[in-house]
């Protein structure tokens, strides 16, 4: 659908007007944004700046090492997912500034807001892959010595990206632009119209595959890994624990509001007061989820500084140290290159 060429002011203060005063302009503007929208804009701005610069730096650092270091492959893919999502932010920012008016057309409506969901699925699937890698390093070190290679890592990443794209398709397909008559505004959103069951199904799948199942499996996975590491008195296990906890927590904390409001809205009538309240918080929940797209580089830097004691190195060299380290861990009387105790545990969360 082509974009609409008129600008649209906010007429929101007439939304609940029940009596008509012929001396009051019925189609004049009120330019104030709601508090949740203002907060969302602030978050979007910060995420864009930190996310684009931070992830670009991570991509730059890891791209050179990806041929030989498996860790670098994981971090490169995570950074690409985050970087891609950040590219949609200026458009989403502009839409909120214009009171959710969407002048960018139907194609942009389908693609751009779907990027954060692609990021969610890509990140969680990559994290699941990374977690499996770490699990194998701890519990199957011999197998890792024989089969763990860059080729297999790239295949695993490709599968993760493919599945992520598949899981994003429902959101992509149901996104439409709706041009509202009064106030004159073009909106970009999902429209299931006659099919409330399908809307609920999409929300439930998103909650289960993008949140609950990963939460369960990653918690179990890292519980086993950490128990084994502690029992073997592996070096730097407390540092590992701190980074893992930070990473897991960041993913699930920042996605929680989005997932909760999403599932609630799918079960509510669109005209109900609760639905309308949640809809007003929608942008804030999306922006909160978007923090995941800039948190990884921050965790890498903070963890890197922790490992160094203080920031003695340049940022790129610090990141290189963190993201491409393949440290040695004692396991079953053999030595294997492992990521278990690398500071790079960030791969945990989105």
């Amino acid at each position: 659908m082509d974009s609409f060429n008129y600008t649209t002011p906010d007429y929101g203060h007439y939304d609940d007007k029940d009596t008509l005063d012929l001396n009051t302009p019925v189609d004049k503007t009120s330019n104030t944004l709601r508090v949740p929208d203002i907060l969302a804009l602030v978050i979007f701005a910060v995420v864009f700046l930190v996310g684009v610069l931070g992830n670009a730096l991570v991509v730059w650092v890891t791209a050179f090492e990806a041929k030989r270091t498996i860790n670098a492959i994981w971090f490169l893919n995570l950074a690409v997912a985050d970087f891609l999502s950040c590219l949609a932010l200026p458009i989403l920012f502009t839409s909120i500034v214009q009171h959710h008016h969407w002048p960018f057309g139907g194609a942009a409506c389908s693609i751009l807001p779907s990027l954060i969901l692609l990021n969610m699925y890509a990140s969680i699937l990559l994290l699941a892959t990374i977690s499996a890698d770490r699990f194998l390093l701890v519990f199957k070190p011999i197998w890792c010595q024989n089969f763990r290679g860059a080729g297999l890592a790239w295949i695993a990443c490709a599968v993760a990206w493919g599945l992520a794209l598949l899981l994003t398709i429902p959101s992509f397909l149901y996104r439409v632009v709706r041009e509202e008559y009064f106030p004159p505004k073009v909106l970009c959103g999902v429209d299931y119209s006659h099919d409330k069951r399908r809307e609920r199904a999409v929300a439930i799948v998103r909650l289960v595959l993008g949140f609950l199942w990963p939460l369960l499996t990653l918690t179990i996975c890292y519980t086993f890994i950490l128990l084994r590491t502690w029992s073997r008195r592996a070096t730097r296990s407390t540092k590992t624990l701190k980074v893992v906890v930070a990473v897991v927590a960041s993913f699930f904390i920042f996605w929680l509001p989005y997932q909760v409001t999403g599932i609630m809205m799918s079960f509510l009538e669109p005209s109900s007061p609760t639905f309308l309240l949640l809809k007003k918080l929608d942008s804030l929940c999306v922006s909160f989820a978007y923090i995941n797209c800039c948190i990884n580089p921050i965790i890498y830097v903070v963890a890197g500084q922790g490992f160094q004691g203080r920031l003695r190195k340049s940022l790129p060299s610090l990141l290189r140290n963190v993201l491409t380290e393949e440290s040695v861990v004692r396991e079953s009387k053999s030595f294997t290159r492992s990521t278990v105790d690398t500071m790079a545990q960030k791969t945990q969360a989105v």
Epitope: Y11, L22, V26, R178
Partner: antibody, heavy 119, light 112 residues
């Protein structure tokens, strides 16, 4: 008392233009929108377009290239112009307004102008 | 465009009886502000349409209480509890949630 009164020609030749005037009273055009709707013989109603209080216009995309809506606030008049008329443009043309668009449908209507497109 | 489908096309009814007209939209008519801009009009022969019900169930000023509207999302109904002679004419449902506003095909209420 809100009123909308229409004036315009009854017969128009094919390929010619149609101009209809809607004069309103009881409210100000600077505050309220006015829409145009037509009804072909024996058929349903078709929305043509709207001009809002601030002068912003929106047209039915199917007819956009042939339609023009304008107004003169001081004279409380709204004008509809349809270009390149064909026989299937034969219809009763109405101006209408909700006044309060955040609540109502088209609450107030003009009396209608029957336009016949014929050679 | 939103397609408004009205049934039945013609509704023969005895005076004093109840009449019911159905209207279905091809898309949800819930506005982003939570309102549903579905309206009902009555057009008598040779007259302009007249607003009866606005926003699904609200009667416009001067409309008798025998007229009632209901529905949500995409399915709506207009009921006339006791049909009187002055109620005869063509009833249209219409939506003004989305551009362009669209009208149903009409239901002709006539004496059985």
């Amino acid at each position: 008392q809100v009123q909308l009164k229409q004036s315009g020609p009854g017969l128009v030749a094919p390929s010619q233009s149609l101009s209809i005037t809607c004069t309103v009273s009881g409210f100000s055009l600077t505050n309220c929108g006015v829409d145009w709707v037509r009804q072909s013989p024996g058929k349903s109603l078709e929305w043509l377009g709207v001009i809002w209080g601030d002068g912003l216009t929106k047209y039915n995309s199917a007819l956009k290239s042939r339609l023009s809506i304008s107004k003169d606030n001081s004279k409380s008049q709204v004008f509809l112009k349809v270009n390149s008329l064909q026989t299937d443009d034969t219809a009763v043309y109405y101006c209408a307004s909700a006044l309060d668009y955040s609540n109502y449908g088209f609450a107030y209507w003009g009396q209608g102008t029957l336009v016949t497109v014929s050679a | 465009d939103v397609v408004m489908t009205q049934t039945p096309l013609s509704l023969p009814v005895s005076l004093g009886n109840q009449a019911s007209i159905s209207c279905r939209s091809s898309q949800s008519l819930v506005h982003s502000n939570g309102n549903t801009y579905l309206h009902w009009y009555l057009q008598k022969p040779g007259q302009s349409p007249r607003l009866l019900i606005y926003k699904v169930f609200n009667r416009f000023s001067g409309v008798p209480d025998r007229f009632s509207g209901s529905g949500s999302g995409t399915d709506f109904t207009l009921k006339i509890s006791r049909v009187e002679a002055e109620d005869l004419g063509v009833y249209f449902c219409a939506q003004s949630t989305l551009v362009p506003p669209t009208f149903g095909g009409g239901t002709k209420l006539e004496i059985k």
